[in-house]
């Protein structure tokens, strides 16, 4: 079965800056990735970026740079300043829409014991399944 992993890292150089990395472990082709914070997309979460593998990338503050890292993983850098900046216990979620598997979402946050600049290895987070 497909899985989604989420990794959250606080940058050592800027303590209010976060990097979120997400990946899809499955055989299908990815049609869309949505990154949100504050909970799953459509369940109280706020969209930070939407990435289409060919059409392009859309992102909104405090997202600074969303990009594809590979054909099945993405990264997102968050700028931390002002009221909309993330905090250490913020939950980030990534939803991968894939054909033919459907839609798969996982969430993660900064590991409680992490030092800045360190992060837990990118292990699959709890999986939520939703039909396309």
């Amino acid at each position: 079965t497909p899985e989604v992993w989420v990794q959250v890292r606080m940058e050592a150089t800027e303590l209010s800056s976060f990097t979120i990395r997400c990946g899809f472990l499955g055989s299908g082709s990815i049609s869309l990735v949505t990154v949100s914070w504050g909970g799953p997309n459509g369940a109280g979460g706020t969209t930070l970026a939407v990435l289409h593998p060919e059409r392009g990338i859309r992102q909104w503050a405090p997202a600074r740079q969303a990009r594809w890292e590979t054909q099945s993983s993405i990264s997102l850098i968050l700028e931390g300043s002002g009221a909309s900046s993330p905090c250490a216990n913020t939950t980030f979620c990534c939803k991968f829409a894939s054909f033919p598997e459907g839609s798969w979402e996982a969430c993660g946050s900064l590991p409680p014991s992490s030092d800045p600049g360190l992060s837990a290895p990118p292990t699959p987070a709890p999986i939520l399944r939703a039909d396309l």
Partner: antibody, heavy 114, light 113 residues
């Protein structure tokens, strides 16, 4: 079927404001940004900015900051663009678009004339 | 901002012949992570909104005839109409879909010779 239907043509005086609407149907309105594009008479296409209706997050082209303001109403699946302090050079057709410019409204002609 | 420059500004081609429009970007539109080029092509006829023809530099939008094709990578891209039809008379625009703000080329007017 995805459709974007815009409000009708407007004639405005210099210094006034205008609000253009864009009603979407056929897709999940809150999940994809509504883009706004300007085309002056006989000219090319210019991106004004975008709004993500689900969160009202916006991105503006620097050139249009202070000129354009975007809002969206998810209860009616309608996005709005207000243009303020109108000048004759704001005379143009204004388009809304969605899903990475795959779908377009029919355009709204805004004419600014004294 | 990324500057998109099209050539030629206008083009006259005989019916059934090949039409080629070029587009050059001031920065690379290639996303190295997934090796995709974020470049789109549009067709606009008088009094109508633009119509998306090609995205990802070479992927045809649904419903677009296969006589339209896109190619190129990095900073240099081409839209080709393999056999010009009367209904293809229009202005064609390329667009940077790689980074904000999305920017368009100045347009190429295609006419029948």
């Amino acid at each position: 079927e995805v459709q974007l239907v815009q409000s009708g043509a407007e004639v405005k005086k210099p210094g006034s404001s205008v609000k253009v609407s864009c009603k979407a149907s056929g897709y999940t309105f809150s999940s994809f940004s509504i883009e706004w594009v300007r085309q002056a008479p006989g000219q090319g296409l210019e991106w004004i900015g975008e709004i993500l209706p689900g969160s009202n997050s916006t991105n503006y082209n620097e050139k249009f900051k202070g000129k354009a303001t975007f809002t969206a109403d998810t209860s009616t699946n309608t996005a709005y663009m207000e243009l303020s302090s109108l000048r004759s050079e704001d005379t143009a057709v204004y388009y809304c678009s969605s899903y990475w410019f795959a779908y377009w409204g029919q355009g709204t002609l805004v004419t600014v004339s004294s | 901002d990324i500057v998109m420059t099209q050539s030629p500004d206008s083009l006259a081609v005989s019916l059934g012949e090949r039409a080629t429009i070029n587009c050059k970007s001031s920065q690379s539109l290639l996303n190295s992570g997934n090796q995709k080029n974020y470049l789109a092509w549009y067709q606009q006829k008088p009094g109508q909104p633009p119509k998306l023809l090609i995205y990802g530099a070479s992927t045809r939008e649904s419903g677009v005839p296969d006589r339209f094709s896109g190619s190129g990578s990095g900073t240099d891209f081409t839209l080709t109409i393999s056999s010009l039809q009367a209904e293809d008379v229009a202005v064609y625009y390329c667009q940077n879909a790689h980074s904000y703000p999305p920017t368009f080329g100045q347009g190429t007017k295609l006419e029948i010779k």
